[in-house]
């Protein structure tokens, strides 16, 4: 990881946001086709 | 990074290099700024790979990040400067290592 | 918006003595843990101390220790030295979707005498 200079830390939070992102962006358009669908 | 002086509503470009390690696609490059005597404040992350940005709520809109993972390369683009954007700014890799600073005077 | 209150904001103590420096987070740390701790002197950029609340950054010596967890968090600075003398900061990490990813706490001088 960047020549073993920094810490896994902040890549591991990171991931965390990007996952949690994907998330709400396929939870939100799931519940905008169940709103149109009915 | 050549920081310097600038007249209120200009804009400068802020470049800071990674020297003796190579980014990696998972590295951040972030952004913080210090006003003279005053603490730290945040501005925003790049992500070295996929150029993913977050910036501070009160950015506002008025600076620009951005990278060139080749040539392991950060800049911040600031716009429309006020007196209150005098400060000294830093980068850091994943808010771990950081840059000597660049200091932004905002003067007419 | 998140706030992190840092208190006090000026200490002063003897070489040898304790400090103890405490970071307040509203709303509360992502993951309750991830905050970290800077050292910084006048004229120089932020050092890196502490990660993850109480884990020790590369070369920091073990006279630095960290804890806490949610909103409350402490910097412990066990058997002061002159050289410590400089100010602290805590950096929190936050949930980005709903607030800034990031703050810092407003600071903690530290004085040796």
């Known amino acids: 990881h960047s020549d073993g200079i920094f810490t896994d830390s902040y890549s591991r939070y990171r991931k965390q946001m990007a996952v949690k992102k994907y998330l709400a962006a396929v939870l939100g358009k799931r519940y905008k086709q169940r709103v149109k669908n009915k | 990074a050549e920081g310097g002086l600038v007249k209120p509503g200009g804009s400068l470009k802020l470049s800071c290099k990674a020297s003796?390690?190579?980014?990696?696609?998972?590295?951040?490059i972030c952004w913080v700024r210090q006003a003279p005597g005053k603490g730290l404040e945040w501005i925003g992350c790049?992500?070295?790979?996929?150029?993913?940005?977050d910036y501070a709520n009160w950015v506002n809109g008025r600076f620009t990040l951005s990278r060139d993972i080749d040539q392991s390369t950060g800049c911040l683009q600031l716009n429309s400067l006020t007196d209150a954007d005098t400060a000294m700014y830093y980068c850091?890799?994943?808010?771990?290592?950081w840059g000597q600073g660049t200091l932004v005077t905002v003067s007419s | 918006a998140q706030v992190l209150t840092q208190t006090p904001s000026s200490v002063s103590a003897a070489v040898g003595g304790t400090v103890t420096i405490n970071c307040q987070s509203s709303?509360?740390?992502?993951?309750?843990?991830?905050l970290s701790w800077f050292q910084q002197k006048p004229g120089q950029p932020p050092k890196f101390l502490i990660y993850?609340?109480?884990k020790l950054a590369s070369g920091v010596p073990s006279r630095f220790s960290g804890s806490g967890s949610g909103t409350q968090f402490t910097l412990t600075i066990s058997d002061v030295q002159c050289d410590d003398a400089a100010t602290y900061y805590c950096?929190?990490?936050?949930?980005?979707?709903?607030?800034?990813?990031?703050?810092f706490g407003g600071g903690t001088e530290v004085v040796v005498k």
């Open positions: 850091a890799g994943n808010l771990e290592i």
């Open positions: 003796g390690f190579t980014i990696s696609r998972d590295y951040w």
């Open positions: 790049i992500s070295a790979g996929g150029g993913s940005t």
């Open positions: 709303p509360s740390i992502y993951s309750g843990a991830f």
């Open positions: 993850e609340a109480s």
């Open positions: 950096l929190g990490f936050y949930d980005c979707s709903s607030v800034d990813c990031h703050a």
